[in-house]
Amino acid sequence: MLRGGRRGQLGWHSWAAGPGSLLAWLILASAGAAPCPDACCPHGSSGLRCTRDGALDSLHHLPGAENLTELYIENQQHLQHLELRDLRGLGELRNLTIVKSGLRFVAPDAFHFTPRLSRLNLSFNALESLSWKTVQGLSLQELVLSGNPLHCSCALRWLQRWEEEGLGGVPEQKLQCHGQGPLAHMPNASCGVPTLKVQVPNASVDVGDDVLLRCQVEGRGLEQAGWILTELEQSATVMKSGGLPSLGLTLANVTSDLNRKNVTCWAENDVGRAEVSVQVNVSFPASVQLHTAVEMHHWCIPFSVDGQPAPSLRWLFNGSVLNETSFIFTEFLEPAANETVRHGCLRLNQPTHVNNGNYTLLAANPFGQASASIMAAFMDNPFEFNPEDPIPVSFSPVDTNSTSGDPVEKKDETPFGVSVAVGLAVFACLFLSTLLLVLNKCGRRNKFGINRPAVLAPEDGLAMSLHFMTLGGSSLSPTEGKGSGLQGHIIENPQYFSDACVHHIKRRDIVLKWELGEGAFGKVFLAECHNLLPEQDKMLVAVKALKEASESARQDFQREAELLTMLQHQHIVRFFGVCTEGRPLLMVFEYMRHGDLNRFLRSHGPDAKLLAGGEDVAPGPLGLGQLLAVASQVAAGMVYLAGLHFVHRDLATRNCLVGQGLVVKIGDFGMSRDIYSTDYYRVGGRTMLPIRWMPPESILYRKFTTESDVWSFGVVLWEIFTYGKQPWYQLSNTEAIDCITQGRELERPRACPPEVYAIMRGCWQREPQQRHSIKDVHARLQALAQAPPVYLDVLG
């Protein structure tokens, strides 16, 4: 409530300190501002300041509350409680300051209606404690509590942890417990969250059974406990029983949908909340679905199989067991975490007419067998040419079967002499050889002249993945790219990723910590993610938030997520999944603590101002063995991409990341064109090309292939051995283009042994076909990394 005074006119102007640094905020908090005749006065476009002494005793009915983003309250001795109802209408609130007031109690659910709150300053009040629940679910960047008579107890263990982990600007405040010394020194041995044990039946469970689960809760000061069953839906009839410390749960008449669904027991005390999730496996027989063969780089016969336990598979071709080879093999997509069904492909590498036929997939588990069959025709039999048939003479490379539609000649029914038969036979041979020649010429990308749309990525890239979005080779004409017919959308075979199982992560499981950077697409945050991996209840992740919410951005996001789900390799940055609940859309990646490889190399090179070591990297410049290890890991990631026929198109150290223990992975968060803008050459409107990493054919004809990636890898090697220098750093972009197209090579870096420079040069052959394969490059680097050459950098 307002205590006296009238409501001020809402003539908004900006809040002086803005959402700036903690320091600015603290100064503002203590310095006050110009006096205001009303209890609360508008401030900035969406702020409110309440500084008249003793004018408020609650925050009910603040003027223009629903649009407020900043609320500054000072000198309100009567404002002693902050509760859920006080902030009910403040859904847009970002910054809340209540300082030098009488605040004694903040309800655990006080900020339930202010989910966007990112800065909370409650300094110089009368707070003795603050529940962990108060800040639960908020992404607070700053929390200021200095100047409060805090009472050290387990209830403040969460705050002590924030101080230990450097969260929310808490460490700088050096919080004290009233008469008890620093909060940091508070004993916490007995301050644990509850411990939970969930007993699951060890016998196998069948459809229709009843299952009893029991959750034992132990710990001090238990407050409440329960079950989270949101994933179960119609998987079983649920009956809860018992209470603390032993909760019972009966799942009656279970269905197979219960598989992979989490049943979670939770308990809370004043220290925090604990959750334990279990899954009940319900046995059911195998089932299988087959879909029509689709052509990608390889052909794919898509399938879905289900069953618990997971069925084993067997392919039959025309009724006989099909033995898999490196040309015909089963490939699974990464399974969804919460279902038993698995999707995959029978991959056929460049099949011919001999592979046409009936494909059967047999799935079996101990509870039953199932099979499905499909006819697949990959190519007409080239030897079934009938001299009596009309001879097609026009070729269309767009046609699916390499010859055009209508016959040019009518079938002649008159019997001819031997000479005509011989003539026809000769013609047939000529026709076949011409056909093969045409297919060979027109169909470099596709052996059998069956064309599919190329996959083109927008040049400014949504993120890491879109750099990978070229399947096989692609060439962009100089007019393509942004602003042309592409309009920045990905063009692709629509069936390609339609079955990818993208893992969805709950928003409540993601706790944003702080911002790591910003790109054209949006921001990247460091976050803590709960329930992501079974072996860790929480882990640090990098979260990419999509700024734009347009339908096309959403579709790009979806496609990108599907693609990333497919890319699973120890040297490709791991993609955990997406969060699509609400806005913004989020992508969750593994967090690589040392950041991008370029920055890492520069900070661990001979020129680094301060060569800081760490627990996993020794101080001083990286040694030859380490440089080789880095190079070998990037090569391993590229071997994987090449094997999938993905063309990266922007391989550079800035687009690789370094994690704990000098683990290097390919991947970035789409910020390179913003952070490393000088590495790109702007062509036309918005197209930015990494010309210093590109081979002549990519610069001249926009031709991007696995071979152009090999060239880029050679440049990456050069970057590694120069500790992150920019290629052709002494030249402008146009000069660099001239050098590359004229065939000049980067010089051997000082730290680079001749053996490694020979590898670089093998990557920089002018003719793409002459370049070493990435597989060979990787093998050579691996061999060198295992036994680094003795190399002395003898300075002249």
Epitope: R314, L362, P366, G368
Partner: antibody, heavy 120, light 106 residues
Framework: QVQLQQSGAELVKPGASVELSCTAS????????MHWVKQRPEQGLEWIGG????????IYVPKFQGKATITADTSSNTAYLQLSSLTSEDTAVYYC?????????????WGQGTSVTVSS | DIVLTQSPALMSASPGEKVTMTCSAS?????MYWYQQKPRSSPKPWIY???NLASGVPARFSGSGSGTSYSLTISSMEAEDAATYYC????????TFGGRTRLEIK
């Protein structure tokens, strides 16, 4: 090469229990499924049930549920069949068999069989 | 339960003769499996997935069928083929065997 060695013949009294063993060599039972099949004198074959030794999950024909218990010990690469409350109906040769490696669980290798005679 | 009925229960054939035995299922099964058993021996896998011969099985044997009707054929009977043959389904639990067909040489 793959072999399944079964324990020797058993003569047991009605109402008693018996445990038969089947020791595998030439492969790891954890990688397959292990089955037990019954053949009464001059009769056909009857599948009793099987076990996935990797996790201990079992499956039985309903008529043998309660009569037969299948277990496995991966450290000794051995599967077991325990038969309880024996009657003359249980007099038979019991075979252990390996579920086809990696595909449809059909039985590709069989033990030599263990003869169980229930008689007072 | 799926009941498998084998016929004939007993048959004899002369060397060189073509032999066909059938296995009929009470409801549709995806595939049929066949085993051969000789006196005082364990059964041996003979045909799996309806038409695929187990290793070591002579090419004169073949299997065919679908749905509820399956058969095992010997194109030219030989003395060593005299044995008892069982069909088995692995489509749904309980995994039943057929009653058996005893094949003798004339």
């Amino acid at each position: 090469q793959v072999q399944l060695q079964q324990s020797g013949a058993e003569l047991v009294k009605p109402g008693a229990s018996v445990e038969l063993s089947c020791t595998a060599s030439g492969f790891n039972i954890k990688d397959t499924y292990m089955h037990w099949v019954k053949q009464r004198p001059e009769q056909g074959l009857e599948w009793i049930g099987g076990i996935d030794p990797a996790n201990g999950n079992t499956i039985y024909v309903p008529k043998f549920q309660g009569k037969a218990t299948i277990t496995a010990d991966t450290s000794s690469n051995t599967a077991y069949l325990q038969l309880s409350s024996l009657t003359s109906e249980d007099t038979a040769v019991y075979y252990c068999a390996r579920g086809g490696y990696d595909f449809d669980y059909a039985m590709d290798y069989w033990g030599q069989g263990t003869s169980v005679t229930v008689s007072s | 339960d799926i009941v498998l009925t084998q016929s004939p229960a007993l048959m004899s054939a002369s060397p060189g003769e073509k032999v066909t035995m059938t296995c009929s299922a009470s409801s549709s099964v995806s595939y049929m499996y066949w085993y051969q058993q000789k006196p005082r021996s364990s059964p041996k896998p003979w045909i799996y997935l309806t038409s695929n011969l187990a290793s070591g099985v002579p090419a004169r044997f073949s299997g065919s069928g679908s749905g509820t009707s399956y058969s095992l054929t010997i194109s030219s009977m030989e003395a060593e083929d005299a044995a008892t043959y069982y069909c088995q389904q692995w489509s749904s639990n309980p995994y039943t065997f057929g009653g058996r067909t005893r094949l003798e040489i004339k």
